[in-house]
Interface confidence: medium
């Protein structure tokens, strides 16, 4: 026999971004609780199956009322430790769950109401007569700090309380038959009662002659482990003694689950998965109805008024199993495309986007062109999620990658000629054109489009193709920097565009999740 | 110069936990996703998770079954991956490398941590 | 997971010559594929992303082509420093997977 001891250190808001609203406040004032559960061995922690090795419940801590305006504050706890009895062995290897409530002491009709904050659980080896352990545990935005520690109550001592002592019966020796008792120098360890080849390491016993067994074995002198049978599926090495197979830790052997469930190895363990209307770690716990609120984590219970009819429990996100007992990594679903990072919030999962990508699961595929896809000096221009290249003169092909001939298309009309330029081709017209390819005749009508050339300057000379060549090249520039202010603007849009599309199809995505 | 130092060599036992540093230099720490990437001998390249250093959010490969803790120190500059309940497979070379924030996953990569676990 | 298949395994290729390596995703990534040199002594080094863009600073005889699940690098003119170890990635969805790498030799 022994005491699991808890004591909580500090429950309030974690580290990182979103801290979590007070649970209190002016209007509202309320003082925390809390509850621990105690189950043996390595079991599913979750809240389904009976707080076998015990549980307890905290004193009310002091009253509080938020601050207008102030960072929520780590919440006043209630004084003292938390103690959970044990009155077999103390398992060494267990399960706890540890609840956060809250008491709102308003005016509430029908006295004070309860709600769960926060519901923290793991899996943990200890053994008794150790020191301390100290943890913390997030749950949602709120942090949980505690310690904890399993001791043997008198005359019990040892790592699983399983060794009995006695006083002394001299100052100075033990009395026949008994060996002094570490660390307690003032006692003597009791003489071995146990069934005569009991196994020392996995079997205790508190009257003579008995065998009890620890969590994990079992047999008439603790030596089998449990779920394992006998000689038909041999796994591990020969038996000299009885000449059959002794079956290795086979978990799943024989079948550990009771009432039709199904058995499934877990890395350490085995998982049972129950039929309705059974639960508990082997399935064992039967004739549940909703009187006995099997759903958890906020599960609805619908059906099973009477104890031989089943019950199902509708689980809120985030939860499945039969008693929605199993968190559900949603995140492992792998929601989010194109490399997102994925948050699953509780009541949603959201996707956080890398640069150039947007949606809900970050599926639209904002910015092409972030990548200087387009090669020797060529532009990158986006559109319909895909990019195409405008390419610097002499380069051509879908990535500016392939060297092109400007003149090669013969760009120059009413044989005008073509000349490669660092600034673009350039076209030097036949006499009575003009144009930047030479598209447009000098006398539309008959009469001069331009004024008459000076003298000595005929209308096909160089100086003029010069000036008229420049006239092209600052239209030019003047289209590109307007090009390049359209497409700012219509990206801005479209970002815009995205990010209420993103608004929007969030609940679409969080209903479609749960389906 | 974008730069990732990675800490030494280690030498672990069966069943014991490895913590390997990446110390950033040359950018925005918190700017920049950072990968880690692990690669047993004569094997290819396995991606082990992501981690975002401004505000710890990551994504992990769940081959490794929660065994896989990834960190960062920001104010140091400096990420973490510790990887626990090691086994004799987990004898690899362990890279970190920068995410791009553009669309290209790993534009910089460490030098690399030699671990491994024999008994 | 979306298992990426590398061929050929080891590649040997004349000085000038061309090097071509494939790779072959079990489902379409898009266009979401890279490509890395792996030389000892080195830090690994990106060459190609979204399977056909070009990072700064890496030569031009590299070159990638392909969409959906098929795609190529190329080494349009193999150089001695050339001579390395080639993954392809696809950073399509998590978790990011590898190709099992393509070892390049001159003949």
């Known amino acids: 026999a022994g005491v699991f001891e808890l004591q909580i250190h500090s429950f309030g808001p974690g580290p990182g971004p979103g801290a979590p609203r007070s649970p209190c406040s002016a209007r509202l004032p309320c003082r925390l609780f809390f509850r621990v559960c105690l189950k043996p061995g390595l079991s599913e922690e979750a809240a389904e199956s009976p707080c076998a090795l015990g549980a307890a419940l905290s004193a009310r801590g002091p009253v509080y009322t938020e601050q207008p305006g102030a960072p929520a504050p780590d919440l006043p706890l209630p004084d003292g430790l938390l103690q959970v009895p044990f009155r077999d062995a103390w398992p060494g290897t267990f399960s706890f769950i540890i609840e956060t409530w809250r008491e709102e002491l308003g005016d509430q009709i029908g006295g004070p109401a309860w709600s769960l904050l926060a519901r923290v659980a793991g899996r943990r080896r200890l053994a008794a007569g150790g020191p301390w352990a100290r943890d913390i545990q997030r749950a949602g935005a709120w942090e949980l700090r505690f310690s904890y520690r399993a001791r043997c109550e008198p005359p019990a001592v040892g790592t699983a309380c399983t060794r009995l002592c006695r006083p002394r019966s001299a100052p100075s020796r033990c009395g026949p038959g008994l060996r002094p008792c570490a660390p307690l120098e003032d006692e003597c360890e009791a003489p071995l009662v146990c069934r005569a080849g009991c196994s020392p390491e996995h079997g205790f016993c508190e009257q003579p002659g008995e065998c009890r067994c620890l969590e994990g074995w079992t047999g008439p002198l603790c030596t089998v482990p449990v779920s394992t049978s006998s000689c038909l599926s041999p796994r591990g090495p020969s038996s000299a003694t009885t000449g059959c197979l002794v079956p290795g830790p086979g978990p799943c052997d024989g079948n550990p689950c009771a009432n039709g469930g199904s058995c499934s190895e877990t890395p350490r363990s085995f998982e049972c998965t129950c039929p309705r209307g059974f639960y508990g770690l082997r399935c064992e716990v039967s004739g549940v109805t909703c009187a006995d609120g099997p759903c958890f984590n906020g599960g609805l219970c619908v059906g099973g008024a009477d104890p031989d009819s089943a019950y199902i429990c509708h689980c809120p996100p985030g939860f499945q199993g039969s008693n929605c007992e199993k968190r559900v990594d949603r995140c492992s679903l792998q929601p989010c495309r194109n490399g997102g990072l994925c948050l699953d919030l509780g009541h949603a999962l959201r996707c956080r986007c890398r640069a150039g990508f947007a949606g809900p699961r970050c599926e639209h595929d904002l910015d092409d062109c972030a990548g200087r896809a387009c090669a020797n000096g060529g532009t990158c221009v986006e559109g319909g999620g895909a990019h195409r290249c405008s390419c610097a003169l002499g380069f051509g092909g879908r990535d500016c990658r392939e060297r092109a001939d400007p003149c090669a298309a013969r760009p120059c009309a009413h044989g005008g000629r073509c000349y490669a330029h660092f600034s673009g081709l350039v076209c030097a017209c036949a006499p009575g054109y003009m144009g930047a390819r030479c598209e447009f005749p000098v006398h539309p009508d008959g009469a001069s489009a331009l004024p008459a050339a000076p003298p000595g300057l005929r209308p096909g000379d160089p100086q003029r193709y010069l000036a008229g060549v420049i006239a092209v090249i600052v239209v030019v520039v003047i289209a590109i920097v307007a090009g390049i202010v359209v497409l700012v603007i219509s990206r801005k849009k479209r970002m815009a565009k995205y990010e209420k599309a993103e608004i929007k199809e969030m609940g679409e995505m969080h209903r479609e999740l749960n389906a | 110069e974008v730069q990732l130092v990675q800490s030494g060599a280690e030498v672990k036992k069966p069943g014991a936990s490895v913590k390997v540093s990446c110390k950033a230099s040359g950018y925005t720490f918190t700017s920049y996703w950072m990968h880690w990437v692990r690669q047993a001998p004569g094997q290819r390249l396995e991606w082990m998770g992501v981690i975002d250093p401004s505000d710890s959010l990551a994504n992990y490969n769940q081959e490794f079954k929660g065994r896989v803790t990834l960190t960062v120190d920001t104010s140091a500059s400096t990420a973490y991956m510790e990887l626990s309940s090691l086994r004799s497979e987990d004898t690899a070379v362990y890279y970190c490398?920068?995410?791009?924030?553009?669309?290209?996953?790993?534009?910089?990569w460490g030098q690399g941590t030699t671990v491994t676990v024999s008994s | 997971d979306i298992v990426m298949t590398q061929s050929p395994d080891s590649l040997a290729v004349s000085l000038g010559e061309r090097a071509t390596i494939n790779c072959r995703a079990t489902k379409s990534i898009s266009k979401y594929l890279a490509w890395y040199q792996q030389k000892p002594g080195q830090t690994n080094k990106l060459l190609i992303f979204?399977?056909?863009t070009l990072q700064s600073g890496v030569p031009d005889r590299f070159s990638g082509s392909g969409s959906g699940t098929d795609f190529t690098l190329t080494i349009s003119s193999l150089q001695a420093e050339d001579v390395a170890v080639y993954y392809c990635q696809q950073h399509h969805e998590y978790p990011y997977t590898f190709g099992g790498g393509t070892k390049v030799e001159i003949k």
């Open positions: 490398a920068r995410d791009s924030t553009v669309v290209a996953p790993m534009d910089y």
């Open positions: 979204s399977g056909s």
